[in-house]
């Protein structure tokens, strides 16, 4: 996309990491077949992708989860792509929802989110889910990334 | 994206093709409203997209399938985006899973996969599914593509 | 992506809008955290994204809906990404289908569509669904966009 020193390619693809934390923010790692083009995008605290340059970015996340209707709350499983810009409150960019499966012990489902957004220097994006304990971390099932247009 | 002779755009979008083969690798065709930007990306043997240039690519696949819980194995329907680099074994880049529907005769569901990956010259990507006989080949339901950043 | 006056970035991301119209074409708005890079892409009549320049575009849509098997027709919920080129009939680029949920009063599900397509100057893309009354318009649930390669 962006060629030359003035316009280096900026892209990232990180892999889900199981976490003992009770937070609803998913954890990610630079492992397996990951992508981190350069230091103009970084994975911070294993939870957010932070960009150094302003611009339009295509941001995406995929979350696979395994849940059961009887064992889960009545509310659906929701994955949210969220933005934290410097000096601003967090906001939701994208959400997807899937009702829990009736399959036993649980039924797997995959969610994909993606969209084009303007990011400011220092902006961070992260992924939130209603129940992180239901997320599938087998390789390739859950990932998160972006690319600068 | 990449302008001029030095940086031609490289992109492909191919359409699913029903196959009598028993292989779990999906078959594709340059038909309908397909995209094949130039010979720097090619569809080989109707099953894999092969690139000539090293670089970062956004690769995606969409698979629609129709299955029934009683008529299928207990395992979910899984679609995998796979990579074969020259001189290396195949590996899975992305996977998505959906539990079979209880709808009769079968319930349709759609899976979308997408991510940014570094590809080497001669690398091929392909899509694998647990049961190709369940895949829907109606217009627009199942497709596969990439674009070079 | 495309730098300089000759190659401005062209991208859009619009947000779903509830509509009293009975049409199956979804309505969109430039509201919330939307993107409209410049006047080389426009949202027309709140229903279609129209481009002024020929080229390859990655076009995507996400639709979240809430439906119930008993209250819906037997046919699945289908979302279609459609193209209207000047002087041509409309055509379907991408479709995704999800069987209705058995959850009461309704079960939420999300669909993601995306692919690379060649668009002509004046071409418009829009999103069609089988039942627009089932679409979820909460923040981030349903969106539509494109980016020029």
């Amino acid at each position: 996309m962006q060629k030359g020193d003035q316009n280096p390619q900026i892209a990232a693809h990180v892999i889900s990491e199981a976490s003992s934390k009770t937070t609803s923010v998913l954890q990610w790692a630079e492992k397996g077949y990951y992508t981190m083009s350069n230091n103009l995008v970084t994975l911070e605290n294993g939870k957010q992708l932070t960009v150094k340059r302003q611009g339009l970015y295509y941001i995406y996340a995929q979350v696979t989860f395994c849940s059961n209707r009887e064992a889960s709350s009545q509310a659906p499983f929701i994955a949210s792509l969220c933005l934290k810009s410097p000096g601003r409150f967090e906001r939701i960019l994208l959400r997807a929802a899937n009702t829990h499966s009736s399959a036993k012990p649980c039924g797997q489902q995959s969610i994909h989110l993606g969209g084009v957004f303007e990011l400011q220097p220092g902006a961070s994006v992260f992924v939130n889910v209603t129940d992180p304990s239901q997320v599938s971390h087998g390789t390739g099932f859950t990932s998160f990334g972006l690319l600068k247009l | 994206m990449q302008k001029g002779d030095q940086n031609p755009q490289i992109a492909a979008h191919v359409i699913s093709e029903a196959s009598s083969k028993t292989t779990s690798v999906l078959q594709w065709a340059e038909k309908g409203y397909y995209t094949m930007s130039n010979n720097l990306v090619t569809l080989e043997n109707g099953k894999q997209l092969t690139v000539k240039r090293q670089g970062l690519y956004y690769i995606y696949a969409q698979v629609t399938f129709c299955s029934n819980r009683e008529a299928s194995s207990q395992a979910p329907f899984i679609a995998s985006l796979c990579l074969k680099s020259p001189g290396r074994f195949e590996r899975i880049l992305l996977r998505a899973a959906n539990t079979h529907s209880s709808a009769k005769p079968c319930g349709q569901q759609s899976i979308h996969l997408g991510g940014v990956f570094e590809l080497q010259p001669g690398a091929s990507v392909f899509v694998n599914v647990t049961d190709p006989s369940q895949v829907s080949h109606g217009t627009g339901f199942t497709s596969f593509g990439l674009l070079k950043l | 992506m495309q730098k300089g006056d000759q190659n401005p970035q062209i991208a859009a991301h619009v947000i779903s809008e509830a509509s009293s119209k009975t049409t199956s074409v979804l309505q969109w708005a430039e509201k919330g955290y939307y993107t409209m890079s410049n006047n080389l892409v426009t949202l027309e009549n709140g229903k279609q994204l129209t481009v002024k320049r020929q080229g390859l575009y990655y076009i995507y849509a996400q639709v979240t809906f809430c439906s119930n098997r008993e209250a819906s027709s037997q046919a699945p919920f289908i979302a279609s990404l459609c193209l209207k080129s000047p002087g041509r009939f409309e055509r379907i680029l991408l479709r995704a289908a999800n069987t209705h949920s058995s959850a009461k009063p309704c079960g939420q599900q999300s669909i993601h569509l995306g692919g690379v397509f060649e668009l002509q100057p004046g071409a418009s893309v829009f999103v069609n669904v089988t039942d627009p009354s089932q679409v979820s318009h909460g923040t981030g649930f349903t969106s539509f966009g494109l980016l020029k390669l």
């Epitope: - | 001189g87 290396r88 074994f89 694998n128 | -």
Partner: antibody, heavy 123, light 113 residues
Framework: QVQLVQSGAEVKKPGSSVKVSCKAS????????ISWVRQAPGQGLEWMGG????????NYAQKFQGRVTITADESTSTAYMELSSLRSEDTAVYYC????????????????WGQGTLVTVSS | DIVMTQSPDSLAVSLGERATINCKSS????????????LAWYQQKPGQPPKLLIY???TRESGVPDRFSGSGSGTDFTLTISSLQAEDVAVYYC?????????FGQGTKVEIK
């Protein structure tokens, strides 16, 4: 516990073929790379080729191309290596070795090995 | 093919002392995409199959004692046994896992002095 159990020793005449089997247990056979590595008496290790059963297409070292065939039977969790046109210098211990699974990578590193099968080629 | 060259061919070290084995590849085995070195180390005792010790140049396989460590990048790699034990007497091989054919070094025999 992952185990790779190979077939027994073989004595073969020059020009003939040998087929060695490798039965896997304790893992999801179809998603792991199975390679074949040989070791001539008192010599080092030599990779011959390998296969991931779910993909079914074998990779071969150029040196053995056309003379070796590697297959896998998912139903019995067994991999096979057939070497044809045998000559005396093919006398070696033949090992099957498992790489990481296709989703854990790298499949090109071998974490479990069979006990080895001695193939003697002699007239 | 990538040629792997180990040095020395054999090594005699006192119990409790450090043993160092070098391995040089004829071309880089570093993947630019994720900075991973596709290099592994194996231990082979007489009459046994090889055993994986280290992969990705420096990652210890589970169950391998921490006296074994790997280092290096690109074309030059080292296996270190920080404090040699009697059970470490074996032949050690490096292997490039970068591209087919996956090739091994000629081996280094480690004995007790």
């Amino acid at each position: 516990q992952v185990q790779l159990v190979q077939s027994g020793a073989e004595v073969k005449k020059p020009g003939s073929s040998v087929k060695v089997s490798c039965k896997a247990s304790g893992g999801t056979f179809s998603s792991y790379a199975i390679s074949w590595v040989r070791q001539a008496p008192g010599q080092g290790l030599e990779w011959m080729g390998g296969i991931i059963p779910i993909f079914g297409t074998a990779n071969y070292a150029q040196k053995f191309q056309g003379r070796v065939t590697i297959t896998a039977d998912e139903s019995t969790s067994t991999a096979y290596m057939e070497l044809s046109s045998l000559r005396s210098e093919d006398t070696a211990v033949y090992y099957c070795a498992r790489g990481a699974s296709v989703w854990d990578g790298p499949a090109e590193v071998f974490d479990y090995w069979g006990q080895g099968t001695l193939v003697t080629v002699s007239s | 093919d990538i040629v792997m060259t180990q040095s020395p061919d054999s090594l005699a070290v006192s119990l409790g002392e450090r043993a160092t084995i070098n391995c040089k590849s004829s071309q880089s085995v570093l993947a630019s995409s994720n900075n991973e070195n596709f290099l592994a180390w194996y231990q082979q005792k007489p009459g046994q199959p090889p055993k994986l010790l280290i992969y990705s140049a420096s990652t210890r396989e589970s169950g391998v004692p921490d006296r074994f460590s790997g280092s290096g990048s690109g074309t030059d790699f080292t296996l270190t046994i920080s404090s040699l034990q009697a059970e470490d007497v074996a032949v050690y091989y490096c292997q490039q896992a970068y591209t087919t054919p996956f090739t091994f070094g000629q081996g280094t025999k480690v004995e007790i002095k």
